[in-house]
Interface confidence: medium
C-alpha cells in the first residue's frame, strides 16, 4: 500500500530513508536536456523474496530535442524523499541495508539522471530526520518518522525533532524539563514505559539537572 | 542462529579500568540498538549503558555515568564497554543485548525490549 502524503516536514531539516521497503518505486526522471529512453521503465520497483530484495527495471536517460524539455526533477543518492526530496546536509552513518530482510539499498545512479529523485514510500517505511547545517537538533524523541494505516488510511507519523540556530534557546518552548531518552515510537506507541521524570538529556546545551535515574547522550 | 558472545572481564582492584568487548554474528548488526546490563549477586539485572545503531545517541545509568562509555564498531559488529574507575559495587555478571527493533532511534533501558542476549562475562572488583 503506498503512502498518500509525503513525510512531515520539519523546519530546518531534512529526512532520508536508509533503506526502503519493498514496493517502494523510484520515478525514473532525467536531467534537463534528457528523457527517458523509448519505452523505457517509468519507475523501479523494489521487489524480493525471503532472502533477497533488489530494484526492478532499469531507468534510462537519453538525450532530448532541445525545444521539447519539459523536465520534473527528481532525487540523487544523498537528497531523497517521496515526491519532494532535500539534501542531508551531513550524510548519516551508512547502514547495512542490504541485510535488513524486505527492504532494498539505496539504487545507484544512472546516466544523466535527475539531481533529485522521488520516491513513493509504502505503509511501514521509516524516514530519519537531521537538521541542516547550521542547525542544532532537540530531541523529545525519535527523529524518524514511520508511514503507517490506521482506519484505512496512511499517515505518518511525528518526528520529534527540533531543530534550532546556534544562538536559539536550547529548550523545547513549553518544557520545563528536557527528556533524555526518546519514549517510545512515535505519536505515543509506547513500548518502554518511563516516565520524562526518570531521564535528563545531557547535550552541550542542557543545563545541570537533579539526580536521575539515566542520562542520554546525543551526539 | 543469532549470537552475542562478551569477553573482558576479570577480577580487578577498586579504581582500575577494564574494557569488554561483544561480538556479534547472525544479524543486521549494524540496525539495531545494543545494550549493556548486569547483574549483581542476588540482586535484580540492571541496565548500564546502550547505543544507537548509528552511534548518534548513548544512554547510561547514573550510577556509571562519567565512569563508563558505550561505543561500538558497525564494521566489525563490535560492541565495546570501557569502563573506568571501578568500585567494589560495580561487581557483576555483565551482559550484552541487541535491541529488538531495527533502525530506531527509541532508546531502551528495560531489558524486555532487548531479544538477544548473550551469556555475559564476570566482572569482580575488589577493595
Known amino acids: 500500500e503506498l503512502c498518500d502524503d509525503d513525510p512531515p516536514e520539519i523546519p530546518h531539516a531534512t529526512f532520508k530513508a536508509m533503506a526502503y521497503k519493498e514496493g517502494t518505486m523510484l520515478n525514473c526522471e532525467c536531467k534537463r536536456g534528457f528523457r527517458r529512453i523509448k519505452s523505457g521503465s517509468l519507475y523501479m520497483l523494489c521487489t524480493g523474496n525471503s532472502s533477497h530484495s533488489s530494484w526492478d527495471n532499469q531507468c534510462q536517460c537519453t538525450s532530448s530535442a532541445t525545444r521539447n524539455t519539459t523536465k520534473q526533477v527528481t532525487p540523487q543518492p544523498e537528497e531523497q524523499k517521496e515526491r519532494k526530496t532535500t539534501e542531508m546536509q551531513s550524510p548519516m552513518q551508512p547502514v547495512d541495508q542490504a541485510s535488513l530482510p524486505g527492504h532494498c539499498r539505496e539504487p545507484p545512479p544512472w546516466e544523466n539522471e535527475a539531481t533529485e529523485r522521488i520516491y513513493h514510500f509504502v505503509v511501514g517505511q521509516m524516514v530519519y530526520y537531521q537538521c541542516v547545517q547550521g542547525y542544532r537538533a532537540l530531541h523529545r524523541g525519535p527523529a524518524e518518522s514511520v508511514c503507517k494505516m490506521t482506519h484505512g488510511k496512511t499517515r505518518w507519523t511525528q518526528p520529534q525533532l527540533i531543530c534550532t540556530g546556534e544562538m536559539e534557546t536550547s529548550q523545547f518552548p513549553g518544557e520545563e524539563k528536557p527528556q533524555a531518552s526518546p519514549e517510545g515510537r512515535p505519536e505515543s506507541e509506547t513500548s518502554c514505559l518511563v516516565t520524562t521524570t526518570d531521564f535528563q538529556i545531557q547535550t552541550e546545551m542542557a543545563a545541570t539537572m537533579e539526580t536521575s535515574i539515566f542520562t542520554t547522550e546525543y551526539q | 542462529e543469532v549470537q552475542l558472545v562478551e569477553s573482558g572481564g576479570r577480577l580487578v582492584q577498586s579504581g582500575g579500568s577494564l574494557r569488554l568487548s561483544c561480538a556479534a554474528s547472525g544479524r543486521a548488526f549494524s540496525t539495531h540498538n545494543m545494550g549493556w546490563f548486569r547483574r549483581a549477586p542476588g540482586k535484580e539485572r540492571e541496565f548500564v549503558a546502550a547505543i544507537s545503531w548509528n552511534v548518534d545517541n548513548k544512554l547510561y545509568a547514573n550510577s556509571v555515568k562519567g565512569r563508563f562509555a558505550i561505543s561500538r564498531d558497525n564494521g566489525r559488529n563490535m560492541v565495546y564497554l570501557q569502563m573506568n574507575s571501578l568500585k567494589p559495587e560495580d561487581t557483576a555478571v555483565y551482559y550484552c543485548?541487541?535491541?529488538?527493533?531495527?533502525?530506531?532511534?527509541?532508546?531502551?533501558?528495560?531489558?524486555?525490549?532487548?531479544?538477544?542476549w548473550g551469556q555475559g562475562t564476570q566482572v569482580t572488583v575488589s577493595s
Open positions: 543485548a541487541a535491541d529488538n527493533i531495527p533502525l530506531s532511534s527509541d532508546m531502551r533501558a528495560t531489558a524486555t525490549e532487548y531479544d538477544v
